[in-house]
Each structure stands twice: as C-alpha cells, then as structure tokens.
C-alpha cells in the first residue's frame, strides 16, 4: 500500500504521528473501534514528551488511551511492550478495583484530570484520542 506522508484533515501532527482528539464520549470498546475504522488506534504513550503533548490537547478531562488488561496482563493496543515502556499511573494505580459493584473490575486506562493514568470501568463514556503513525503503509491500494 501507499505510505501516509501527511495527516488527515482535523488531525494534529506531532513527532511523525497524527492525533485526533474527540470532543464526545464513548465506552472504551467503542472508542477502540472508532480509531480502527480510521486506520488508527487509541493513543499509545511511549514517552514523557508524548504524554505532555497529549495532556496539553485534552485538558483536565477523563480520556481513554490504548491500554487495557481485559485479557489479563496490561497491553498496549499496537503491541508496544507494557513492562518496559513508559508509565504514568496515579499513586496506587492500577488497582483493578472490583469494589465498585458495577460488574467486573477496572480494565481500561484513561488520562485523569491531572494527566496521570487510572484504570476504570470500560463502559463509561469518556473522550478518547486516536493515533496513527506517518510513513506507515496505509490500507489504500497504490494508484496505477
């Protein structure tokens, strides 16, 4: 496929990635699906610099990222290694709290109002951020 060399309209370019910031809320699974349909993924935070960039754009609002432990261990949606990668959890998080009584634990990660991360009930409709990398092969066939 052809390579994406510039960001789509309404996406923000930063360090060879494109970001789209929602202004509405979706459950984590619905946000994940939205990004996939855009040939992107929920944002994967790999550095303090990227954390600050995303935090600047979302403000003090709960916002989903591409990190979850719905199948056991914590995993980034693009396969980035969680154990060795950047982390910015709030103190004593993640706690996979079952005591909320809503069913299940807390399997999806979001930016909190101060930018640090928390695990929460995946069904809650929070804002979300999609990310796609420039220079990656897109799904579109090349022009002949």
């Amino acid at each position: 496929g052809s390579e994406r060399t510039c960001c789509p309209v309404n996406w923000v370019e930063h360090e060879r990635s494109c970001y789209w910031f929602s202004r509405s809320g979706k459950a984590w699974a619905d946000a994940d699906n939205y990004c996939r349909l855009e040939d992107a993924h929920l944002v994967v935070v790999t550095s303090w610099e990227e954390q600050k960039f995303v935090q600047h754009h979302i403000g003090p609002v709960n916002t989903w990222m591409g990190l979850h432990d719905q199948n056991g261990p914590w995993k980034w949606v693009d396969g980035t290694d969680y154990e060795t990668g950047f982390k910015n959890w709030r103190p004593e998080q993640p706690d996979d709290w079952y005591g909320h009584g809503l069913g299940g634990g807390e399997d999806c990660a979001h930016f909190t109002d101060d930018g640090r991360w928390n695990d929460d009930v995946c069904q809650r409709p929070y804002r979300w951020v999609c990310e796609t990398e420039l220079d990656k092969a897109s799904q579109e066939p090349p022009l002949l």
């Epitope: 699974a29 809503l102 069913g103």
Partner: nanobody
C-alpha cells in the same frame, strides 16, 4: 425488546431542582448496572453517573458531584436522577443507559433539561 423511557425534564431557574425518571422494560432491570449520560447543545456525550444493580454503589462525574443523586427502585424498574443546585452548564438532553459487558448497550430517547433565568 429493551425499552428505556426518560421523563422529568423541563425548564428550571439556576439553583433549582429537577428529578428525572427512567422507566425500563424488556430486561431484568435488577440485574444490571445503569447509567445517566448527557449531551449539551452542540457538545459531545458526557458521563454523569452510574449505579450498581442493587443500588448500593453510586458514582458521579466531578462536574455533578455533591449536586446530583442517582438512585433506583428495582420493584418499579425505574432509575432516577435527583438534580439540585442546577447551573446553566447542566443544560442538556439527559439519557439513561443500560450497562452491558463492554459498553452501554441500550439507551433511551432522552429528556431535555434547560437551566435558564
């Protein structure tokens, strides 16, 4: 067929109160967590509050904490949202929603709350 029917919205002055109701049918209401969400004019969907199946556990968005109270009556298959100290920024269409395994899988048609003097 799952149905959720909200009522109780209307025009209220700043500082006033309203009580929203959501009548549920078509599923075992007492077995599911429920949620209130809202959408302000020209804005996106926002989580407001949710409640556990038995009603013992309740949670609120920071923007409504201390002013809104979610409750439920499982004998009447009804969800409530008591809204006090209303502000202009609470103006929105309010929806009740049933929490599924990965998302909120059903929601009603909404009831409009307008806070204005």
């Amino acid at each position: 067929e799952v149905q959720l029917l909200e009522s109780g919205g209307g025009l209220v002055q700043p500082g006033g109160s309203l009580r929203l109701s959501c009548a549920a049918s078509g599923f075992t209401f007492a077995a599911y967590s429920m949620m209130w969400v809202r959408q302000a004019p020209g804005k996106g969907l926002e989580w407001v509050s949710d409640i556990s199946p038995g009603g013992r556990h309740t949670y609120y968005a920071d923007s409504v904490k201390g002013r809104f109270t979610i409750s439920r009556d499982n004998s009447k298959n009804t969800l409530y949202l008591q809204m006090n100290s209303l502000r202009a920024e609470d103006t929105a269409v309010y929806y009740c929603a049933k929490m599924g395994s990965t998302t909120f899988d059903y929601w009603g048609q909404g009831t409009l709350v307008t806070v204005s003097s």
